[in-house]
């Protein structure tokens, strides 16, 4: 399986909400011993390998934000914890999954990573991620709404699997 990022850059005004999206592509093993986790975390630019470093999103770890199920099932976080931080992650039956961030501030700017982890027999993990940048702007140069910039076809299919 692969992860595609439809948009590589989101430029948003302060105070706006944004939904960052990723899509799980390709065949997904629906065996009874396979569990899929989809989650999000922050990372930083300038690494040897994108998304290798991980940091929390608004103080929430990837475990606080994850969805887990078998295959292409729909799910969403109903965590009070996430919603108290203005966050909600969700996924649908078509492999799309997202994180919505409410009331953006300049501190939310940075690199975001979506991650899909396949676990077999509750043992080791096979993981694939996608990366996108969020720029939160303020002042007269800020857009009135979020502007999204599509990934190049190469980028959106550029898969980093560990």
């Amino acid at each position: 399986f692969k992860v595609a990022t439809p948009y590589s850059l989101y430029v948003c005004p302060e105070g706006q909400n944004v939904t960052l999206t990723c899509r799980l592509l390709g065949p997904v093993d629906k065996g009874h011993d396979v569990t899929f986790y989809k989650t999000w975390y922050r990372s930083s630019r300038g690494e040897v390998q994108t998304c290798s470093e991980r940091r929390p999103i608004r103080n929430l770890t990837f475990q606080d934000l994850h969805l887990h199920h078998g295959g292409h099932q729909a799910a969403n976080t109903s965590h009070d914890l996430a919603q108290r931080h203005g966050l909600e992650s969700a996924s649908d039956h078509h492999g799309n999954f997202s994180i919505t961030m409410r009331n953006l501030t300049l501190l939310d700017s940075g690199l975001y990573c979506c991650l899909v982890v396949e676990i077999r027999h509750h043992h080791s993990e096979h993981r694939v991620h996608g990366a996108m940048e969020l720029q939160v702007q303020t002042g007269k140069d800020a857009p009135s709404n979020c502007v999204v910039y599509p990934s190049s076809s190469q980028d959106s299919e550029n898969i980093t699997a560990a």
């Epitope: 989650t39 975390y41 940091r55 606080d64 994850h66 991650l115 396949e118 077999r120 993990e125 096979h126």
Partner: antibody, heavy 121, light 112 residues
Amino acid sequence: QVQLVQSGAEVKKPGASVKVSCKASGYSFTDYYINWVRQAPGQGLEWMGRIFPGSGNAYYNEKFKDRVTMTRDTSTSTVYMELSSLRSEDTAVYYCARDDSFYGYWYFDVWGQGTTVTVSS
Amino acid sequence: EIVMTQSPATLSVSPGERATLSCKSSQSVLYSSNQKNYLAWYQQKPGQAPRLLIYWASTRESGIPARFSGSGSGTEFTLTISSLQSEDFAVYYCHQYLSSYTFGGGTKVEIK
């Protein structure tokens, strides 16, 4: 840089408990598992368990599950490993080590310097 | 549990020579989904903590000299040190991370 610094050597009597600390720096403490691995004198490495500092959830090797407790203090980025009902066979160097897994298992990329625990009457 | 067996227990080699260390697992550590071997190698010098050398059976950790190489797949793995330097005399451990964590008993590489 990423670093794990452990507490100093301990000498304990059989039946007592020992609590070893491991202070992390240089990375997001809450987002990476910390493992404990021990090494008896002249012996190999033995995995004891691990803790995810973000949640405090701990997972133990069956061999140690009745005697070991792993905790964390996010305010000081420190993980603790307490081993109770000590016996002479627990004399070993205890290491903390970070792993890079999300939900499964991974290799250990950073290690503490080790803490020597001696159990002797 | 997956049992890791290393051989030989001690290897006597002269500086500049090649050292070949073996590690065998009681079951395959190859993960079908990504065709990766969940095996790492560590070096440990006296009084020091282990140091990661190799992961995924053959990928060198950043900063590790090119004279260290890993190979093998499934259940049989090899760590090769192409030309031993004085600082390479140490104990080497293999480690599987496919199913929980287990280590081999170690191979001590000593000066001949």
